[in-house]
């Protein structure tokens, strides 16, 4: 699909000179200027003509007010000044502050726990299928198939450490070579970035907040995808990761060491273990080709058991299977031998909710998935609200300055690298890149952290998770030490290579530009965020996997034309931006294609229609929920009353392209202005068209 012209003004810095523009570009959009204005080659710039951009893919919508949506919002302090408060007011303020801080920690704790439960839920729903992906060894020798298996498995189990441990076991037992494991590790790296993207979806209520949150989350996705796009072919051609890690292993004689301290797990486990406990070995057994494991439940029932080793007479297929003739005999029909049989005797049951329910894994998975997403969403809303009310005025200024300001002049370039170290350190502490990046997402959304600062923090998080894996590998038993260490090092050097590709030179920081572009599209068409998530993390990997099953010729036959088409679109896009004069008039824009091929507008109309029908049915339910939320949150500008208007009334009302304000539960007190007069509140009642963008969520 060609890029969308309605979103083409990708201007990171409107004040800079750009080739093809007559002068410094004003932030005032073209439609507000005179239509007769000409560019450098004398051609009149029509009202609809769009200005060029730095990036071929960054697609940014126009902003009538002339404000840059990526500017961090001013978190104004609307409360009474400290000096103006009396003693009682000051005491109350302190108590409120402490209370808010405790609540914030509480919601943050629940947020992290719900992420853990979400991972368990995904494993219950798709863990066995994920394990089966691994059991097809012939496919995994194909690097592209390996990559998508890594993506799919990690998305399904919501844990790169689970997929990594399966890979380690398979390498250790020679079911997989390190060479074949590298693309899977790369895929696992991509798969792990879905978590914070899901978290970002929860902030879809406020357009600008969502724009920032979604961009902040997808900067991780783009970094991983772009790294793979460059490094997978490089690895397939040169095997540099395999060679480099072999070299490291041979140079340094690694000894078994201590595992990384599980600081976060120590706090969250007591709670999450009361909800669900899983037997991760089942997925591993399926991956290793154990057919019996297919019928086992992932839900852990027994937590305490003792192991008895007893000598037992067991039958063997033939005398060749005997350890020695001394330990072999026959009863005339079968051959018998003595074997040490390990029998597990269960002593105590686990203490989680589902221990006594004989529900299938899928049912428990769906229940937990629903509950964890609701809790995750609720916690996120509350965190955003609390942060919004805490981060005001001076506090906000200090925090924003601390987080987003660079070092003084000669050392400005070091700031990003420090952020990488901070990201790595924080991830090492919490032992999960998903937790760290997911916790960062709402902060990006409300404007505490800029995308430019979130990017190195995310890269650091990628490094942090690999250092954790290296320590875990060092703590693994002797037989798996080498393979687990080599895989952990491959993961580490892959991320280092990615950082070297997409960070040091500001020009190469493509993930930021791409994420901002996607943020803009998703802010305008919120359904696109869901489409992106499904398309990039499920549809594309599943399609590639399906084609891999059909064999190399089919994969190449289908893949190459698609890649060539994408490259053609990309080249054409670049030419349209950089030097449109060399192109024929027809190719200077995408108007030669049908509208649905180069614009999201027709698609939006279709989705609006679908969601309108859906909205009619669940409208009254929405209104009740909205009112309850308003009561709980104490929102001043709740708009539930006109939720269920007649279609006629809706059409009569003029369409206003006001940025969609969050309804009810999504209302962010920190970000929205106080509603002084009711009239203003009434104007903000959304038309069905505008509202349709939120209904996806």
């Amino acid at each position: 699909m060609a890029p969308w012209p309605e979103l083409e003004n990708a201007q990171p810095n409107p004040g800079k000179f750009i080739e093809g523009a007559s002068g410094p570009q004003s932030s005032i959009p073209a439609k507000d200027k005179e239509a007769s204005k000409t560019n450098d080659n004398g051609t009149p710039v029509a009202k609809t003509e769009l200005l060029p951009s730095y990036s071929a893919l960054v697609l940014i919508e126009e902003h009538p007010e002339g404000t840059d949506p990526w500017d961090l919002p001013e978190l104004q302090d609307t409360g009474i000044k400290w000096s103006e408060r009396d003693t009682k007011g000051k005491t109350l303020c302190i108590f409120q502050g402490v209370g808010k801080f405790i609540l914030l920690l509480g919601f943050l704790y629940l947020f992290v726990c719900s992420l853990d439960v979400l991972s368990s839920a995904f494993q219950l729903v798709g863990g066995k299928v994920a394990g089966q992906f691994f059991s097809n060894n012939s496919i995994m020798s194909n690097p592209v198939a390996g990559l998508v298996i890594g993506v799919l498995v990690t998305v399904m189990v919501q844990s790169s450490s689970t997929s990594s441990s399966i890979i380690v076991s398979m390498v250790a037992s020679s079911l997989l070579t390190v060479r074949a494991a590298i693309p899977i590790i790369m895929g696992a790296n991509i798969g792990t970035s879905i978590t914070n993207t899901i978290v970002a979806l929860m902030q879809a209520g406020d357009r600008n907040e969502f724009r920032r949150a979604f961009a902040g989350a997808t900067v991780h996705d783009f970094f991983n995808w772009l790294s793979v796009f460059v490094l997978l072919p490089l690895e397939a051609a040169t095997h540099y990761l395999e060679i480099l890690t072999n070299l490291v292993l041979e140079t340094f004689k690694f000894q078994n060491g201590e595992d990384a301290p599980d600081i976060l797990k120590v706090i969250t486990d007591p709670f999450t273990k009361l909800i669900i406990q899983l037997d991760k070995k089942v997925i591993q057994q399926i991956a290793m080709g154990d057919s019996a494991a297919q019928n086992k439940s992932l839900i852990k029932i027994w937590c305490k058991s003792i192991t008895n080793v007893t000598e037992m007479n067991v039958t063997v297929p033939s005398t060749d299977n005997c350890t020695s003739p001394s330990y072999c005999w026959t009863d005339g029909i079968q051959t018998w031998t003595i074997q040490n049989v390990t029998q597990k005797e269960n002593i105590a049951k686990c203490q989680h909710i589902f221990v006594n329910f004989s529900l299938p894994d899928l049912a428990v998975g769906i229940i937990l998935l629903t509950v964890s997403l609701v809790v995750l969403c609720g916690c996120l809303i509350m965190i955003v609200k609390l942060l919004g009310s805490v981060l005001r005025g001076q506090v906000a200024t200090v925090i924003k300055k601390t987080l987003n300001t660079d070092f003084p002049f000669p050392f400005a370039w070091l700031t990003g690298y420090l952020a990488i170290l901070v990201g790595a350190g924080m991830t090492f502490i919490v032992q999960s890149s998903s937790v760290f990046t997911s916790a960062m997402t709402p902060l990006i959304g409300i404007g505490v952290i800029s995308i430019e600062r979130a990017y190195p923090l995310t890269l650091g998080s990628n490094i942090g998770t690999t250092t954790t894996a290296i320590l875990a590998a060092l703590a693994s038993p002797g037989n798996t030490l080498r393979s687990s260490l080599q895989i952990a090092l491959c993961h580490f050097f892959f991320n280092i290579s990615g950082i070297l590709l997409w960070y040091p030179i500001p020009f190469t920081r493509l993930p930021i530009r791409l994420a901002k572009g996607l943020g803009n599209i998703s802010a305008k068409y919120r359904w696109f965020a869901v489409f992106y998530l499904i398309f990039f993390f499920f549809v594309t990997p599943l399609t590639v996997f399906g084609l891999s099953l059909a064999g190399w010729p089919v994969l190449v036959g289908v893949g190459v034309p698609i890649i060539l088409l994408l490259l053609l679109v990309l080249c054409l896009r670049m030419l349209q931006f950089r030097c449109p004069r060399i192109l024929p008039l027809k190719l200077r824009d995408w108007n030669f294609l049908p509208l649905w091929m180069h614009s999201l507008k027709p698609w939006d109309n279709v989705i609006s229609l679908a969601t309108t029908c859906f909205q009619r049915r669940c409208c009254c339910c929405c209104r009740v929920c909205c009112r309850v939320c308003c009561m709980v949150c104490g929102c001043k500008c709740c708009r539930c009353s006109k939720c269920c208007r007649d279609q006629g009334e809706e059409e009569e009302e003029k369409e206003q392209d006001i940025p969609v304000k969050a309804s009810g539960a999504f209302d962010n007190a920190a970000m929205s202005k106080e509603c002084q007069d009711e009239g203003k509140g009434q104007v903000e009642v959304l038309s069905m068209k505008a509202l349709s963008n939120t209904t996806v969520f």
């Epitope: 007479n313 001394s326 072999c328 026959t330 009863d331 005339g332």
Partner: antibody, heavy 120, light 107 residues
Framework: QVQLVQSGAEVVKPGASVKMSCKTS????????MHWVRQAPGQGLEWIGA????????SYNQKFKGRVTLTADKSTSTAYMELSSLRSEDTAVYYC?????????????WGQGTLVTVSS | DIQMTQSPSSLSASVGDRVTITCKAS??????VAWYQQKPGKVPKLLIY???TRHTGVPSRFSGSGSGTDFTLTISSLQPEDVATYYC?????????FGGGTKVEIK
């Protein structure tokens, strides 16, 4: 008590076949392996083969393979041995026996024996 | 097939004597060896299995020993009723094989 009652003596011509039976009682027929052992006059013991009545699994001494067939009828708790292409050296007492010592080939209950005489 | 070679083929001893019968296997059979007693005109009777385990009802004067390839049946004090032919048997491999037998007589 465990009892194994074998069919009566047989006189057969060389090249012919003989089918003898072993009716059991006093135990669960399908539980133990049934062995067949022969003893030529004034000679030692020779193992022919065994059958597990529960599944019908059989095992034969290569020396008799192709000539001997062991079967078991669970309904009557009777085991059968058929020996074909008889030769004069097949003249012997044929015993059916069971091993109640699970997993071993040591037989502890024997039938009274069936004398087969191969003579023209 | 595993050959079981018994020696002597016959022996004569006085009542109360200690009698030893040996059995040699052509290859390692572990301890999967049984001993049988067959009195003239009777069916064989199991005496010992697993080289040294006495079967139910077998007098304590009968004992077995050995492992691998060399095995021994010992009658600590020969009694008149012990007159019989004694057979060793291996059940380590199929086919099960018996020794040639040792005929024990009273002097």
């Amino acid at each position: 008590q465990v009892q194994l009652v074998q069919s009566g003596a047989e006189v057969v011509k060389p090249g012919a076949s003989v089918k003898m039976s072993c009716k059991t009682s006093g135990y669960t027929f399908i539980t133990y392996n049934m062995h067949w052992v022969r003893q030529a006059p004034g000679q030692g013991l020779e193992w022919i083969g065994a059958i597990y009545p529960g599944s019908g699994d059989t095992s034969y001494n290569q020396k008799f393979k192709g000539r001997v067939t062991l079967t078991a009828d669970k309904s009557t708790s009777t085991a059968y041995m058929e020996l074909s292409s008889l030769r004069s050296e097949d003249t012997a007492v044929y015993y059916c026996s069971i091993s109640t010592i699970i997993t071993t080939g040591a037989v502890d209950y024997w039938g009274q024996g069936t004398l087969v005489t191969v003579s023209s | 097939d595993i050959q079981m070679t018994q020696s002597p083929s016959s022996l004569s001893a006085s009542v109360g004597d200690r009698v030893t019968i040996t059995c040699k296997a052509s290859q390692d059979v572990g301890t999967a060896v049984a001993w049988y007693q067959q009195k003239p005109g009777k069916v064989p009777k199991l005496l010992i299995y697993w080289t040294s385990t006495r079967h139910t009802g077998v007098p304590s004067r009968f004992s077995g020993s050995g492992s691998g390839t060399d095995f021994t049946l010992t009658i600590s004090s020969l009694q008149p009723e012990d007159v019989a032919t004694y057979y060793c048997q291996q059940y380590s491999r199929i086919p099960l094989t018996f020794g040639g037998g040792t005929k024990v007589e009273i002097k």
